[in-house]
């Protein structure tokens, strides 16, 4: 799902008080519900009907460094008999989320949000095709 | 997927520098490729076979102040005809994201990343069925 | 009523190039997978390439006699589908058959259209 | 890539029951499409999804696959139905004919 645009004021002071220098604000260490963790059933990559591969990157300079992308083994979906069946479609399902990018120069460190897309796995739709006049 | 905890040293200084000054760092405003948009198909909520509703939590102290949620409509996946088979399971797909958390005091405004659980969609996959003896 | 209506067909000499189109009418085109399928004189059927739908990124399959020297590609708002036939042989000498065949999610009913094909010869 | 192995001609007489078979190690994985052609017309798809069959398309043909066997079988074949008989697989690594069968309606 989609992440609003930054323009509007959430990052700002109150209109009353003096405006935050240098174009920066001040970000506390931590992570709130650090230790809350997914649960999803067990193996559903391969399970699913639209099954999807894993493919992580990597990157030291971005928080979480390791970001994983899923990718949609088929173009069909696989029925019941193990079998590929291309009339309904295996697509995937993204996300917009934020990660946290680390820029330094020397003893001078900042960070910067950046939004990255994330591809979460896949789902199998049938494709809307019908006759028309 | 799983963000790993923060405790490593993301957002430490080098060993040689002097530390952050009361446990807070700086955050440049702005949000780096944030015209970056999601490209999912069409409806694909409505067209799964294991389809899912949205349901929008909101919060104007959180960034982005919406989240949407998805809950599959079924516990079964729908079939070519348009009927639940319960032969098969919808289940949800889950992502750790990050969101920042405003949190002022009159004009002293900080803010804190926090971990949200996001579901994201729902696929249809093959129950485990264990046979015991 | 569907309509599949291939067009470009000629004669032409090995080396040459050659673009077929396909224009389609009566269903949702762009939702549908197409296909290109020919037909060598008193021979069997053979599967020349395929385009897929937005849903699936119209990820583009060859055949591997073809590969590399043909190019399908596709414009969903005039409804046609393309075949760019570079490098060509005389073993490419055909009728080319635009296909579709797909679940009509309104009728219930799996269905399949051809055009009426287009001649290709490759001869000197 | 894989091979869809059929025989060139299967002859029947009328009001018999005709079996076209289609071999290829890879059927067990694979969904088969069976399609009618006639000559100088456009191919017909007969039988979808192993044995699924159109609407518009008569009881009389039926598939099966098994194995490494599909198979379309035609009960109480009339004169019409003599034509060319395809075999055909369609998945994410794209898609393969067999080499056609003749049916001859004695």
């Known amino acids: 799902r989609k992440i609003p645009k930054v323009g509007h004021t959430f990052f700002q002071k109150p209109e009353s008080c003096p405006p935050v220098p240098g174009g920066s604000m001040k970000l506390d260490i931590g992570i709130i519900n650090e230790n809350q963790r997914v649960s999803m059933s067990r193996n559903i990559e391969s399970r699913s009907t639209s099954p999807w591969n894993y493919t992580v990157t990597w990157d030291p300079n971005r928080y979480p460094s390791e970001v994983v992308q899923a990718q949609c083994r088929n173009l069909g979906c696989i029925n019941a008999q193990g079998k590929e069946d291309i009339s309904m479609n295996s697509v995937p399902i993204q996300q917009e989320t934020l990660v946290v990018r680390r820029k330094h120069q020397g003893c001078s460190v900042s960070f910067q949000l950046e939004k990255v897309l994330v591809t979460v796995g896949c789902t199998c739709v049938t494709p809307v095709i019908h006759h028309v006049q | 997927r799983k963000i790993p905890k923060v405790g490593h040293t993301f957002f430490q200084k080098p060993e040689s520098c002097p530390p952050v000054p009361g446990g807070s760092m700086k955050l440049d405003i702005g949000i780096i490729n944030e015209n970056q948009r999601v490209s999912m198909s069409r409806n694909i909520e409505s067209r799964s076979t294991s389809p899912w509703n949205y349901t929008v939590t909101w919060d104007p102290n959180r960034y982005p102040s919406e989240v949407v949620q998805a809950q599959c409509r079924n516990l079964g996946c729908i079939n070519a005809q348009g009927k639940e088979d319960i032969s098969m399971n919808s289940v949800p797909i889950q992502q750790e994201t990050l969101v920042v958390r405003r949190k002022h005091q009159g004009c002293s405004v900080s803010f804190q990343l926090e971990k949200v659980l996001v579901t994201v969609g729902c696929t249809c996959v093959t129950p485990v069925i264990h046979h015991v003896q | 009523e569907v309509k599949l209506e291939e067009s470009g067909g000629d004669l032409v000499k090995p080396g040459g190039s050659l673009r077929l189109s396909c224009v389609a009418s009566?269903?949702?085109?762009?939702?549908?997978?197409m296909s290109w399928v020919r037909q060598a004189p008193g021979k069997g059927l053979e599967w020349v390439g395929r385009i897929s739908n937005k849903d699936t990124g119209g990820r583009i399959d060859y055949a591997a006699p073809v590969r590399g020297r043909f190019a399908i590609s596709r414009d969903d708002s005039k409804a046609t589908l393309f075949l760019q036939m570079n490098s060509l042989k005389t073993e490419d000498t055909a009728v080319y058959f635009c296909?579709?065949?797909?679940?009509?999610?309104?009728?219930?009913?799996?269905?399949?259209?051809w055009g009426q094909g287009t001649v290709v010869v490759v001869s000197s | 890539s894989y091979e869809l192995t059929q025989p060139p001609s299967v002859s029947v007489s009328p009001g018999e029951t005709a079996r076209i078979p289609c071999s290829g190690e890879t059927l067990p994985k694979k969904l088969v499409y069976w399609y009618q052609q006639k000559p100088g017309q456009a191919p017909v798809l007969m039988i979808y999804k192993d044995s699924e069959r159109p609407s518009r398309i008569s009881e009389r043909f039926s598939g099966s696959n098994s194995g490494t066997m599909a198979s379309l079988t035609i009960s109480g074949v009339q004169a019409e139905d003599e034509a060319d008989y395809y075999c055909?697989?369609?998945?994410?690594?794209?898609?393969?004919f067999g080499g056609g069968t003749k049916l001859t309606v004695l």
């Open positions: 009566g269903f949702t085109f762009g939702t549908a997978w």
């Open positions: 296909t579709t065949n797909f679940y009509d999610v309104l009728t219930g009913d799996h269905v399949d259209y």
């Open positions: 055909q697989t369609s998945d994410s690594s794209g898609v393969v």
